[in-house]
């Protein structure tokens, strides 16, 4: 065996048990939790990088990650893991999360072509104009989901199961 079957810390994982998904690509299978941006492929019996399947038809397993990957390639957009959606920074400048700081601050420096509501924000007509509060608070700390079936699950290194039958 080369390249597989080794845990990151060399020991057995605490998360090495049967779990049943309420939904998702693989249902009712022996599932091991994987590092972020990976998914458990039960037929291969190993964690696989989501990047390898983003271009395949069968990317449902990593749907959120793949959407996030394609979203990040688009300028002026970021992937909101809570909303599971690709958000245009232009639509939220003035009350934007850190992911949009570069885009929004550059936009605000050159007010040409800004929509009227953003020009008003710039001249102080709207309160909380750069307050990173509300629904976006803390979003920048979210990682990609370990599995679409377990939304928001983030695993510590010693929970990463690379232990195989």
């Amino acid at each position: 065996m080369s390249g597989l079957g080794r845990s990151r810390r060399g020991g057995r994982s605490r998360v090495d048990q049967e779990e049943r998904f309420p939904q998702g690509l693989w249902t009712g299978v022996a599932m091991r939790s994987c590092p972020e941006e990976q998914y458990w492929d039960p037929l291969l019996g190993t964690c696989m990088s989501c990047k390898t399947i983003c271009n395949h038809q069968s990317q449902r397993t990593c749907a959120a990650f793949c959407r996030s990957l394609s979203c990040r390639k688009e300028q002026g957009k970021f992937y909101d893991h809570l909303l599971r959606d690709c958000i245009s920074c232009a639509s939220i400048c003035g009350q934007h999360p850190k992911q949009c700081a570069y885009f929004c601050e550059n936009k605000l420096r050159s007010p040409v072509n800004l929509p009227p509501e953003l020009r008003r924000q710039r001249s102080g007509e709207v309160e909380n104009n750069s307050d990173n509060s509300g629904r976006y608070q803390g979003l920048e700390h979210r990682g990609s989901e370990a599995s679409p079936a377990l939304p928001g699950l983030k695993l510590s290194a010693d929970q990463v199961a690379l232990v195989y039958s």
């Epitope: 065996m1 080369s2 390249g3 597989l4 690509l25 693989w26 249902t27 009712g28 299978v29 022996a30 492929d41 039960p42 037929l43 291969l44 019996g45 190993t46 696989m48 990088s49 390898t52 399947i53 271009n55 395949h56 069968s58 397993t61 195989y164 039958s165």
Partner: antibody, heavy 118, light 107 residues
Framework: QVQLVQSGAEVKKPGASVKVSCKAS????????MHWVRQAPGQRLEWMGY????????KYSQKFQGRVTITRDTSASTAYMELSSLRSEDTAVYYC???????????WGQGTTVTVSS | DIQMTQSPSSLSASVGDRVTITCAAS??????LNWYQQKPGKAVKLLMR???RLHSGVPSRFSGSGSGTDFTLTISSLQPEDFATYYC?????????FGGGTKLEIK
Amino acid sequence: QVQLVQSGAEVKKPGASVKVSCKASGYTFTNYVMHWVRQAPGQRLEWMGYILPYNDGTKYSQKFQGRVTITRDTSASTAYMELSSLRSEDTAVYYCARYDWEGSFDYWGQGTTVTVSS
Amino acid sequence: DIQMTQSPSSLSASVGDRVTITCAASQDISNYLNWYQQKPGKAVKLLMRYTSRLHSGVPSRFSGSGSGTDFTLTISSLQPEDFATYYCQQGNRFPPTFGGGTKLEIK
């Protein structure tokens, strides 16, 4: 179109080794896992092992562990399966098969007959 | 390992017949059941994945059904090119395992 072309038939003596090749075309070789499956005369298809597309990681069936080695040559888009310490019960047709990421094997090689006989 | 049991092991039928082959898994595999066709000296072909999804280029006379442990492959009207051996395979748990095959012969 996707094609997997395997090397020709082999006749080997017990105790020898055999190395079967599988040349892939029509897709990006490094984007898919390659599996090896064999079928002995009158028997069902039997999974042997696979090689991962991006880091040469392999996983083998317990039955063949220690006797089988799966490798690949990315530049030649070719996967290899070597089986050592051959015995008569290893007489079979050996297939390479591409994994489709959804639990099935969507394209197969034409098969390589390996005969082990003294 | 999950055991896959196919029946019948052989079947004689005529062109135009409707034929059903069954496959039983030793434990729940959800819908991760695939069907393959094998002809002597030819590459194995994927017919159906995920119980009922036809692989590209497979004619619509092939259909699949089932869930959990019991599955069927149906050929609605047999054509001369359909006489072959058919295998089921579970794709829900490592390692992948295959049924014993059903040989479909001309009556």
